[in-house]
Interface confidence: low
């Protein structure tokens, strides 16, 4: 580590005196920073000498000596005061620039350490500091304003009390720059716009930035629009607003509008689409199938998307029948607005009852007229089965009626013994009826089918079961004959499985 003679760390001299500062190290040494012309510099191997024959207040500062070859990078310093009764301050810089929230050092150095007790910082022409200005003083370095704010960017003077009077330094201009976190914030209103040809429209592009140095423009498709700009300042931000007002829109006004703003950090843009239409429109659609099938007892939400301009003047859900004259309860209907021109309407149908199958229509109205979207709701039912013994054309016949939706399939089983239901081990014969007769097939209702099993005689110790099934479930009915007999036979077209 180099050594400075005199040993310091401070040296106080009077103006006009001769000052010699010698730095000695193990290897070659050098003085840091720019040395003013008033000094003579002499280097000789491991020592370097600074000499001035006529010290002035401007020589007041810290002198630092380093040894470039030293791996530890050590340095030595001495602070020289040239105490001039007429010049208590040596100002090293007339302008200081910092970013907001950094410490700002105002480098006015006191030429006489005795004056330290009476120093203060003021604004130009002795005006007091702004409230909440937090600062400290070092006789070697000057005044430090801690965490400088944008508003503290002012002209300052350092003041020293000499006797009974305050002596000011020349002024130092502090510039506090705002930290720009990113591109300006943008809003483009509305996010989407639809107008009928001939109507008025307004599009507002506004941008805000932490400082005034930013640009904003509005672009239609690829064309930059020349619009007068309104500027403002509030909430500690600068605002610039562009308003495009169109008295009577036409098709050429339609298209993409982009609001673009830029600052030193970059560019930010947002877009909206302006659609010009010939006349009012009202479109109803659903992502659901308009033909719905739901199992009885389950719930269903019917959802309709509406695109409309101008806005809706009325809307409602209506049950069109065919079963009852009930209407959907208003509390089950829900409306949400996705944006200005698109809405979603939902009808909730919980725990559906047989009487609630049928047509549900959503109707909406705007100046473009009425539109309707109708859902057909069919309920699914598991099969219900019944078997009766009857005589047809003199022949004994088992008649099975199965009712459900979708249309049930019918299978006959003959099994050993008397039982409520044939299990696989007991089955003697299986007949699948490929074409049971459809007795009724009305819209939104169960389909009823009938299957016949002709029997010359039925065996008394056997059970005949009719089974029906569809996608919802299955049902069965077992028949146990009372009288004894010999055999049964299915119709010719039945599929026989032993």
């Amino acid at each position: 580590i180099p050594v400075i003679e005199p040993s310091g760390p401070e040296l106080v001299v009077k103006p006009g005196e001769m000052v010699t500062l010698r730095c000695v190290g193990n290897g070659s040494v050098e003085w840091d920073g720019p040395i003013s012309p008033h000094w003579t510099l002499y280097s000789d191997g491991p020592s370097s000498v600074l000499t001035t024959t006529n010290a002035t207040f401007q020589n007041t500062r810290t002198y630092r000596c380093t040894e470039p070859g030293d791996p530890l990078g050590g340095s030595a310093a001495i602070h020289l005061y040239v105490k001039d009764p007429a010049r208590p301050w040596n100002v090293l810089a007339k302008e200081v620039v910092v970013f907001e929230d950094q410490d700002a050092l105002l480098p006015c150095l006191l030429t006489d350490p005795v004056l330290e007790a009476g120093v203060s910082l003021v604004r130009l022409r002795g005006r007091p500091l702004l409230r909440h200005t937090n600062y400290s003083f070092s006789p070697w370095h000057g005044f430090t304003i801690h965490r400088a704010k944008f508003i503290q960017g002012q002209d300052y003077q350092c003041s020293a009390l000499m006797g009974s009077r305050k002596v000011m330094s020349i002024s130092i201009r502090l510039k506090v720059q705002k930290v720009i976190p990113g591109p300006p914030a943008l809003t483009l209103v509305p996010e989407e716009l639809v107008r009928i040809r001939g109507e008025a429209a307004q599009i507002v592009c506004s941008a805000s930035n932490i400082d005034v140095d930013f640009d904003v423009f509005l672009q239609h498709n690829t064309t930059k629009l020349a619009i007068p700009q309104r500027s403002d300042f509030h909430d500690n931000r600068y605002q610039k607003v562009l308003t495009l007002s169109l008295g009577q829109v036409d098709f050429q006004h339609a298209g993409n509008y982009s609001c673009v703003a830029s600052n030193v950090q970059g560019k930010h843009s947002t877009s909206m689409f302006f659609r010009v239409v010939e006349s009012a429109y009202l479109d109803l659609s659903s992502e659901q199938n308009l033909i719905q099938e739901v199992t009885v007892g389950e719930g269903l939400n019917l959802k309709v998307m509406v695109e409309a301009y101008p806005g809706l003047q009325g809307f409602n859900w209506t049950y069109l029948g065919p079963f009852s004259d009930h209407q959907p309860e208003p509390k089950l209907a829900n409306a949400t607005t996705k944006d200005t021109y698109r809405h979603t309407f939902t009808l909730s149908l919980p725990r559906l009852k047989p009487s609630e199958a049928g047509c549900y229509s959503f109707l909406a109205r705007n100046p473009g007229g009425w539109r309707a979207l109708t859902f057909e709701l069919t309920l699914r039912y598991p099969p219900e089965v019944s078997v009766i013994w009857t005589s047809i054309n003199g022949s004994g016949t088992l008649l099975c009626a199965a009712s459900g939706y979708p249309q049930p399939n019918v299978t006959w089983l003959q099994c050993a013994g008397h039982t409520d239901r044939c299990d696989e081990a007991q089955v003697l014969q299986v007949w699948v009826d490929p074409h049971p007769e459809v007795l009724s097939q009305e819209p939104f209702q169960k389909v009823t089918v009938q299957s016949l099993l002709t029997a010359e005689t039925l065996e008394h110790n056997q059970t005949y079961e009719c089974r029906a099934h569809n996608s919802v479930g299955s049902g069965s009915w077992a028949f146990i004959p009372i009288s004894a007999g010999a055999r049964t036979h299915p119709p010719d077209e039945f599929l026989f499985t032993p």
């Epitope: 339609a254 993409n256 877009s271 689409f273 659609r275 479109d283 659609s285 998307m305």
Partner: antibody
Framework: EVQLVESGGGLVQPGGSLRLSCAAS????????IHWVRQAPGKGLEWVSV????????YYADSVKGRFTISRDNSKNTLYLQLNSLRAEDTAVYYC???????????WGQGTLVTVSS | DIQLTQSPSSLSASVGDRVTITCRAS???????LAWYQQKPGKAPKLLIY???SLESGVPSRFSGSGSGTDFTLTISSLQPEDFATYYC?????????FGQGTKVEIK
């Protein structure tokens, strides 16, 4: 120049995954909904999926629902399609296409080929 | 979903011919939201017509579209050599978007 450029296609085994990208340039990307459309070799066009301009709405064809995921990064002007649980019938050229909101798909990419084969 | 069926599936024509392709929808296409595209081998489709009859910017005026409801038509008034391609109709509202199966126009 307004353009869309797809990438990320290639050969993948059944059950595998792939991520397609579509890079947009020459227009304000966030102002447009973008679709994916595919075309099996020698076949017609099939709509696959769409995502709204700011990514708040996504829709899928029934044939890909639950397997494919559409997304976009407006800061990068890029659209993505994540293809999972791939099947042989997903083999196709995949196109991204811009929806101008006034009708049809006005700008298409050149397409990227996805081949699903063992 | 709306199904679109194009006819014919393919046709042969000569340069200068008037060509008509039809597109039939399984249900009414709302507000004529129907587009026509041209596709050449190895290339992406190109938009010709939107809103059933609006000509896309830069498309030659020999292409025209008409129709509403369920029946739509693309007409090429005088076929040019560069028009030999496959043509698709598409409905673009509501989702899912659906395309016709295509009509291939070949040189006779």
């Amino acid at each position: 120049e307004v353009q869309l450029v797809e990438s990320g296609g290639g050969l993948v085994q059944p059950g595998g995954s792939l991520r397609l990208s579509c890079a947009a340039s020459g227009f304000t990307f966030s102002g447009y909904a973008i679709h994916w459309v595919r075309q099996a070799p020698g076949k017609g066009l099939e709509w696959v999926s769409v995502i709204s301009g700011y990514g708040s709405s996504t829709y899928y064809a029934d044939s890909v629902k639950g397997r494919f995921t559409i997304s976009r990064d407006n800061s990068k002007n890029t659209l993505y399609l994540q293809l999972n649980s791939l099947r042989a019938e997903d083999t196709a050229v995949y196109y991204c296409a811009r929806d101008p909101g006034v009708g049809g798909f006005d700008v298409w990419g050149q397409g990227t080929l996805v081949t699903v084969s063992s | 979903d709306i199904q679109l069926t194009q006819s014919p599936s393919s046709l042969s024509a000569s340069v200068g011919d008037r060509v008509t392709i039809t597109c039939r929808a399984s249900q009414s296409v709302r507000r004529r939201f129907l587009a026509w595209y041209q596709q050449k081998p190895g290339k992406a489709p190109k938009l010709l017509i939107y809103d059933a009859s609006s000509l896309e910017s830069g498309v030659p005026s020999r292409f025209s579209g008409s129709g509403s409801g369920t029946d739509f038509t693309l007409t090429i008034s005088s076929l040019q050599p560069e028009d030999f391609a496959t043509y698709y109709c598409q409905q673009y509202y509501p989702i899912p978007r659906t395309f016709g199966q295509g009509t291939k126009v070949e040189i006779k």
